[in-house]
Amino acid sequence: EKPVYELQVQKSVTVQEGLCVLVPCSFSYPWRSWYSSPPLYVYWFRDGEIPYYAEVVATNNPDRRVKPETQGRFRLLGDVQKKNCSLSIGDARMEDTGSYFFRVERGRDVKYSYQQNKLNLEVTALIEKPDIHFLEPLESGRPTRLSCSLPGSCEAGPPLTFSWTGNALSPLDPETTRSSELTLTPRPEDHGTNLTCQMKRQGAQVTTERTVQLNVSYAPQTITIFRNGIALEILQNTSYLPVLEGQALRLLCDAPSNPPAHLSWFQGSPALNATPISNTGILELRRVRSAEEGGFTCRAQHPLGFLQIFLNLSVYSLPQLLGPSCSWEAEGLHCRCSFRARPAPSLCWRLEEKPLEGNSSQGSFKVNSSSAGPWANSSLILHGGLSSDLKVSCKAWNIYGSQSGSVLLLQGRSNLGTGVVPAAL
């Protein structure tokens, strides 16, 4: 069977600007191997060009001039001896859009342009974005290699230039960010930030970029306790909080980490296997009792480590006062005052607004104090009779407040009235 001129190539090809495409192609032509063997030359031309004069877009003939604008970008791929006319187009440009025809030449007898099978090339705007590759998850403090590549791009044409931008890159040398690969050591604060790779062909207007949001795994770095939306100050891994006895308390513990740490509250300073009193970051105490003084620990447990903070709770109360009450006894007038407060209050007696301190040098009065449980007692003994109506007061105070009470001793009256007068400091 006599071979004929045949060309198998797709009718149309679309490629995005700046990218590459391989157009598969095969051909046949009439040739008998017992003939002499002049070289086989093949050519791709722009449609409408005259093969004898025109510059080619691609050829295997070293003596034919190639169009400068396609030089190095349009290349024959494959073995033409095996009738492979596949065409590789790199760094496609808008001006490459158009029709192309294939031509074969061998000796004097074979000179043929396959005009009936033209290749239509359409170059469209670049919408392809580069891919950023790295091993996930990114872990804080662990160096990770990232690479940026554009699917469909190839070595043809001017080199690609890269630029990386993002908050995570701030400490890097600018030269490092111009490579298609970079090594990043992410920090906790880089979590959720954007990293962009931009690609551009030198001398061309074609640019494309991809932005990824970094997902950085990190253990808790800090732990904060909030009371009513305000952070408690921390000194040596301890927060201090004075709370009024009986007050409701709602605390929120927070330890930023990714993935989120498991937060729990413990009574006191717990062992690692202790049972939490709250399995969330929220600790609620309906009424703070003095028994809760000492504190609580908030622990943030995370696959990459744990962190904890101690809350030193000091429960305080304003002084509560019972008395004074007075009675006549053998040694004179005996007045008693009972009080409780946290921290323990100071107490003073007054006689007609004059302070009575310690014991009288003349032995006219004597003060005794004792304590039992949360209550403390003080007694005042006044020797001698009353010359006139007399006001006896006792006052208890601590740093949070004070309270005073007084009794009016009426001359010649046995019933002694008392009144408690609260007072703030």
Epitope: F226, N228, G229, I230, A231
Partner: antibody, heavy 116, light 106 residues
């Protein structure tokens, strides 16, 4: 530098609802409480409520419990306040603010006008 | 609810004068009190927190004092840019603002 960018002025009809936004930048959004404060024209400041973005925990001024709903979108670092059943009494400037040891950053405010 | 009573509601003062604004809480607020300054059309700005702590960057002529239920803000020597409205805020039990004090220059 922390920055709170609030949405633009709103003009809405009585009975309608509105959603005001507060976009945070320059700090770790999830780590700090965000508050909303109301200021009627020529009047003082009134605290509406607060939300902790990380835990979703909220607290409201009793007066606003049925009026305001606070939510956050962690992915966009944005806090929202939805105000419902609007009346002329709700016409005010609404501020968002963040706290740590104190109110350290405020948004520029969103003016809401409720009028038919 | 904690009620904050601020006084005076407005005042005039001369440049260089010492100015004091007070706030009284309806109960002990454990020094959980802040002071704010607000200029017309602007957001409030914190001056003092925890009753007496000065915020970084705030001029030292501003000071806060008080405990229990009674608190005050003092401007030691009034300057022109100090005019505005001042608010106290308690944050012991949720948050309550005082009614404000409008400070104007004589």
């Amino acid at each position: 530098q922390a920055y709170l960018q609030q949405s633009g002025a709103e003009l809405v009809k009585p009975g309608a609802s509105v959603k005001l936004s507060c976009k945070a930048s320059g700090y770790t959004f999830t780590s700090y409480w965000l508050h909303w404060v109301k200021q009627r024209p020529g009047q003082g400041l009134e605290w509406i409520g607060m939300i902790h973005p990380n835990s979703g925990s909220t607290d409201y001024n009793e007066r606003f419990k049925s009026k305001a709903t606070l939510i956050v979108d962690k992915s966009s670092s944005t806090a929202y306040m939805q105000l419902s059943s609007l009346t002329s009494e709700d016409s005010a400037v609404y501020y968002c603010a963040k706290t740590f040891y104190y109110f350290d950053y405020w948004g520029q405010g969103t003016a809401l006008t409720v009028s038919s | 609810d904690v009620v904050m009573t601020q006084s005076p509601s407005s005042m005039y003062a001369s440049l260089g004068e010492r100015v004091t604004i007070t706030c009284k809480a309806s109960q002990d607020i454990n020094s959980y009190l802040s002071w704010f300054q607000q200029k017309p059309g602007k957001s409030p700005k914190t001056l003092i927190y925890r009753a007496n702590r000065l915020v970084d960057g705030v001029p030292s002529r501003f000071s806060g004092s008080g405990s229990g239920q009674d608190y005050s803000l003092t401007i030691s020597s009034l300057e022109y840019e100090d005019m505005g409205i001042y608010y106290c805020l308690q944050y012991d039990e949720l948050y309550t603002f005082g009614g404000g004090t409008k400070l104007e220059i004589k």
